[in-house]
């Protein structure tokens, strides 16, 4: 028996989760769909509306100024990632409507369903990138006057999205089309044919690369940066809370049922009922992670210090706003206003 | 135009082991579908016992999936259904049929008979 | 596993009769259903598949419908070589069933 993980998107799906028993069903052979498949078609449906629009307004905002603001780099970079990922939404939700059903060949398989993971690398590498940003301008404001740059923030993001891309390889390797006949199908998913430990393995190193090293790390980062800001009377700011816990804490919850039901099913035999209920669940699961796409555009921009007024003049008018906005660059060190600002304000905006 | 033929020893003895051949015409069976093996009882009750796709990936019927191994030789264009030890309620006639949406192609069939 | 009962399980029909066949299916099988006949040779041939879509080369007479979980197969005008066992097939899941056949008879 193959274990064969089919796409809703990796997890097998969407990615590599569904391990198809061949001997099961592939699904329930009723023509209406399962309640999960039913609300991540919600989900997905209303990611795509307001993660297309939603990041490609942050891209639009902050391309004209990610040659010389730092801050904009960060939220270009994570928009990016964001935004492709939601391009995969529309085949992901037709493979759904129709029973997970995948008539897009092969090398969609292989591609757009790994999109959601590249994407988890990405905006965690980004994210990382960003709290050692912050960190260092709270810890090393000396070092970060003389050092902290527009080139320099380029290369790191270069470098998170190289990193992205080689750990979402395995997924793309490993993700395959298979022929079904009962019912007559084409399914996509992960195929680790018979090989329990590589499943494992790669489920493992997804849980603690794209999981729970981020969560360790920023939490201790996140956790010296507000004890520093909290320590000073002036920096004390609920706004700097806010938007820290939800930068961190949207990440992890959403990806949480993703990572909790994946590493499950990695140890689970694909006969077990504990198996097959989370079989059930993988593409509600992915839908719930897909979140994160639509919710970085709010939380980054809406809420981040120095884009918020700026996106919110530029509804109605962003054009001209963004492109007639004055923005002072140092010279000799490639340094905003915003940099200065925000080191002045013993690092007001973490 | 696919056809399929099999072919097999007639008659064999209880917990004999043998082996079945479906061979396949006009199509190859690494292009794509599911290679079937189905076989009729004395009553005319039909039972689906598993098939081989063309990627070489093998489904048994789970009542049978102890007894039985689908193999194929791709050289030859031909699929093999193996009995472990046959018992006289293995006494049926036995086709092959190509699964792509249901089994749209049949062989004329081989009948087995176990008996001492 | 899902049980096909096919009815009747014989019928005496003469030459240019309308004939319907039916098979109930035990769960859903949302029209993975297809129409085998069965020729005293023991050749086996299918007729109809996803419950109504005939298959190439087979006479306009024979036709395939669906009601609910019932499935219908209906051959407007006998011709003599219609005679013959006839079984329905559902491929919904594994593993895919027969129903018990029905044998049809000169009258």
């Known amino acids: 028996m193959n274990s064969f993980n089919y796409t809703t998107p990796d997890y097998g799906h969407y990615d590599d989760k569904d391990t198809l028993d061949l001997n099961t069903p592939v699904d329930k052979t009723s023509n209406t769909l399962r309640v999960p498949d039913i609300l991540a078609l919600v989900i997905f449906a209303v990611v795509f509306l307001v993660g297309v629009l939603g990041n490609a307004l942050v891209v639009w905002v902050t391309a004209f100024e990610a040659k010389r603001t730092i801050n904009a780099i960060w939220f270009l970079n994570l928009a990016v990632a964001d935004f492709l990922s939601c391009l995969a939404l529309p085949i992901l939700f037709t493979s759904i409507v129709q029973h997970h059903h995948w008539p897009f060949g092969g090398a969609a398989c292989s591609i757009l369903p790994s999109l959601i993971l590249l994407n988890m690398y990405a905006s965690i590498l980004l994210l990382a990138t960003i709290s050692a940003d912050r960190f260092l301008l709270v810890f090393k404001p000396i070092w970060c006057q003389n050092f902290r740059g527009a080139g320099l923030a380029w290369i790191a993001c270069a470098v998170a999205w190289g990193l992205a891309l080689l750990l979402t390889i395995p997924s793309f390797l490993y993700r395959v089309v298979r022929e079904e006949y009962f019912p007559p199908k084409v399914l996509c998913g992960v195929d680790y044919s018979h090989d329990k430990r590589r499943e494992r393995a790669v489920a493992i190193v997804r849980l603690v690369l794209g999981f729970l090293w981020p969560l360790l790390t920023l939490t201790i980062c996140y956790t010296f940066i507000l004890l520093r800001t909290w320590s000073r009377r002036a920096t004390r700011s609920t706004k700097t809370l806010k938007v820290v816990v939800a930068v961190v804490a949207s990440f992890f919850i959403f990806w949480l049922p993703y990572q909790v039901t994946g590493i499950m099913m990695s140890f689970l035999e694909p006969s077990s009922p504990t198996f097959l209920l989370l079989n059930k669940l993988d593409s509600l699961c992915v839908s719930f992670a897909y979140i994160n796409c639509c919710i970085n555009p709010i939380i980054y921009v809406v809420a981040g210090q120095g884009f918020q007024g700026r996106l919110r003049k530029s509804l109605p008018s962003l054009l001209r706003n963004v492109l007639t906005e004055e923005s002072v660059v140092r010279e000799s060190k490639s340094f905003t206003r915003s940099t200065v600002d925000t080191m002045a304000q013993k690092t007001q905006a973490v | 135009d696919v056809q399929l033929q099999e072919s097999g020893p007639g008659l064999v003895k209880p917990s004999q082991s043998l082996s079945l051949t479906c061979t396949v015409t006009?199509?190859?069976?690494?292009?794509?579908?599911?290679w079937n093996w189905i076989r009729q009882f004395p009553g005319n009750k039909l039972e689906w016992m598993g098939y081989?796709?063309?990627?070489?990936?093998?489904s048994y019927n789970p009542s049978l999936k102890s007894r039985i191994s689908i193999t194929r030789d791709t050289s030859k264009n031909q699929i093999f259904l193996q009995f472990n030890s046959v018992t006289t309620e293995d006494t049926a006639k036995y086709y092959c049929a190509r699964a792509s949406i249901g089994f749209d192609y049949w062989g004329q069939g081989t009948t087995l008979t176990v008996s001492s | 596993d899902i049980q096909m009962t096919q009815s009747p399980s014989s019928l005496s029909a003469s030459l240019g009769e309308k004939v319907s066949l039916t098979c109930r299916a035990s769960?859903?099988?949302?029209?993975?259903l297809s129409w085998l006949q069965q020729k005293p040779d023991g050749s086996i041939k299918r007729l109809i598949y996803?419950?109504?879509t005939l298959d190439s080369g087979v006479p306009k007479r024979f036709s395939g419908s669906r009601s609910g979980s019932v499935y219908s197969l209906t051959i407007s005008s006998l011709e003599s070589e219609d005679f013959a066992d006839y079984y329905c097939l559902h491929y919904a899941n594994y593993p895919p069933t027969f129903g018990g056949g029905t044998k049809l008879e000169i009258r």
């Open positions: 081989i796709s063309y990627s070489g990936r093998i």
């Open positions: 006009g199509y190859s069976i690494t292009s794509d579908s599911a």
């Open positions: 996803a419950a109504s």
């Open positions: 769960q859903e099988i949302s029209g993975y």
